[in-house]
């Protein structure tokens, strides 16, 4: 951009050099060029000449007017044309911006990283504001009142180490550009409520050579917490469907879900958890890739029943990945379906 | 750390004028988001400029037309520029610095009384 030129005269923007977007504006460009008469005065944006809807106000003046201006950035300058003088001659230049004032903050989320030692706040800014926006969080005590504030850009990292002195919080964020200020919904935040465990692994799987071959899948996590719930999701990789299966786990050791599945079948396995009975889920897991082994015999083969296997209750739900490249985004479909397990079997996966 | 310490306040008759001033020191005052900020009695702490790095400046809709915030970085030293006062301007007002991540630092503020 234009930062610093030496100005043989003056340019100014009327509403100003930063402007809501779609705005009508005004750009003027004064000359004061000693030995000129300017026989013209030109504006040029991003160094290519205007032709229209420039008006000569006076001798010195001229001022060029565009319809709903649209454009985020825009370098300005002009000339004048002086008579005897081979090339144009500089007189000012300008850097203008439009945008918009920033929407209000939403979907506000406040989670602390287990181990992490920070609260992490995220939050939706909106539509793009094409101008700097500057978010303030806000962190206010319940208990002591005390009231914190951090800049952000689009998240912020908050030391638990300056949450110290009370458990429950409000928090809000303030969006501020110079075309206006908007401010969140309030969170109440509880400290204990909002720890996601540590990030759950799948370390392993294997496929027995049982008459029904089963999938044993191994996964883990760090977390200290105890009581932690966990949803286990897999589908064949030609599949649009994922099948989720729930746990209640305890990490003191690894934990062994069993899976019946189809034969030689390349399978996608993904774990989160969470605290029991909170609100915040880890992410999904990294995808885990398993080849199920090829059915040595004929039989009737049924992937969920089979004479060694008695029902639970609990249900394995079916989602659908809403695009291969978002497998975050699923869609709840009404299907359900109930898991097995072996009636001898003593396994941890039981929940 | 930065340190900020603010000055110029007083009392004031509505219709009149006031320039305050915000003296940084510090070696993280260039990376500073300057703003000024009031509190009235039994009020929550109020955003009334910001210094936006793109040059440009935030001004809270009550002081809109009225306040100016400006910045002489030679001085390390930010202004507001208060005119046509009002009794409701009435507050302590504070100059923060605020850094990406960071917690924001404020002054010791500077009382502004208007009477009418």
């Known amino acids: 951009g234009i930062t610093s030129i030496n100005c043989s005269g003056d340019m100014w923007v009327e509403p100003g050099e930063i402007f809501q977007m779609g705005m009508n504006v005004s750009i003027y460009c004064q000359e004061a060029l000693k030995h000129c008469r300017p026989r013209n005065l030109y504006f040029y944006k991003n160094g290519f000449k205007e032709e229209f809807d420039i008006t000569r106000i006076n001798r010195t003046t001229a001022r060029i007017w565009y319809k709903g201006f649209s454009e985020p950035h825009a370098y300005m300058h002009c000339t004048a044309e002086c008579p005897g003088h081979f090339q144009e001659t500089l007189i000012c230049g300008k850097d203008i911006s439009s945008g918009h004032p920033p929407d209000a903050p939403s979907n506000l989320t406040c989670v602390i990283y287990e181990y992490s030692g920070n609260m992490t706040c995220t939050w939706n800014t909106g539509k793009p504001t094409y101008i700097d926006t500057k978010y303030i969080v806000h962190v206010k005590s319940l208990e002591t009142e005390e009231e914190q504030q951090y800049l952000a850009s689009s998240y912020v990292k908050i030391s638990t180490d300056s949450l110290q002195g009370s458990r429950k919080y409000l928090v809000w964020v303030q969006a501020v550009n110079s075309l206006g200020m908007e401010n969140s919904q309030q969170l109440h935040v509880h400290l204990d409520d909002i720890v996601i465990p540590s990030a759950s692994i799948i370390s392993r799987a294997e496929t027995t050579n049982d008459t029904v071959p089963k999938t044993i899948v191994y996964w883990k996590s760090k977390t200290m917490i105890e009581k932690v719930f966990c949803e286990m999701r897999y589908k064949t990789t030609t599949n649009q469907t994922w099948s989720v299966k729930e746990f209640d786990a305890n990490f003191t050791y690894v934990q062994q879900s069993e899976f019946y599945l189809e034969p030689d079948s390349k399978y996608v396995f993904q774990v989160r958890c969470q605290e029991t009975g909170k609100r915040n889920w880890q992410p999904w897991s990294s995808p885990f890739v398993h080849q199920t082994s090829q059915e040595t015999g004929k039989r009737n083969w049924q992937p969920w029943s089979s004479p060694f296997v008695h029902q639970t209750s609990q249900t394995v739900s079916q989602v659908t990945a809403k695009s291969s490249h978002e497998p975050q985004k699923m869609e709840m479909l009404s299907a359900t379906i109930f898991r097995g397990h072996p009636a001898s079997g003593n396994h941890q996966d039981i929940g | 750390q930065v340190q900020l310490q603010e000055s110029g306040g007083g009392s004031v008759q509505a219709g009149g004028s006031l320039r305050l001033s915000c003296a940084a020191s510090?070696?993280?005052?260039?990376?500073?988001?300057m703003g000024w900020y009031r509190q009235a009695p039994g009020k929550e702490r109020e955003l009334v400029s910001m210094?936006?790095?793109?040059?440009?400046?935030f001004y809270a809709d009550s002081v809109k037309g009225r306040f100016t915030s400006s910045q002489e970085n030679a001085k390390n030293t930010v202004y507001l520029q208060m005119n046509s006062l009002k009794p409701e301007d009435t507050a302590m007002y504070y100059c923060g610095c605020a850094t990406l991540g960071s917690r924001t630092v404020w002054g010791q503020g500077t009382q502004v009384t208007v009477s009418s």
């Open positions: 210094l936006i790095s793109d040059g440009s400046t």
């Open positions: 510090g070696y993280t005052y260039s990376s500073c988001t």
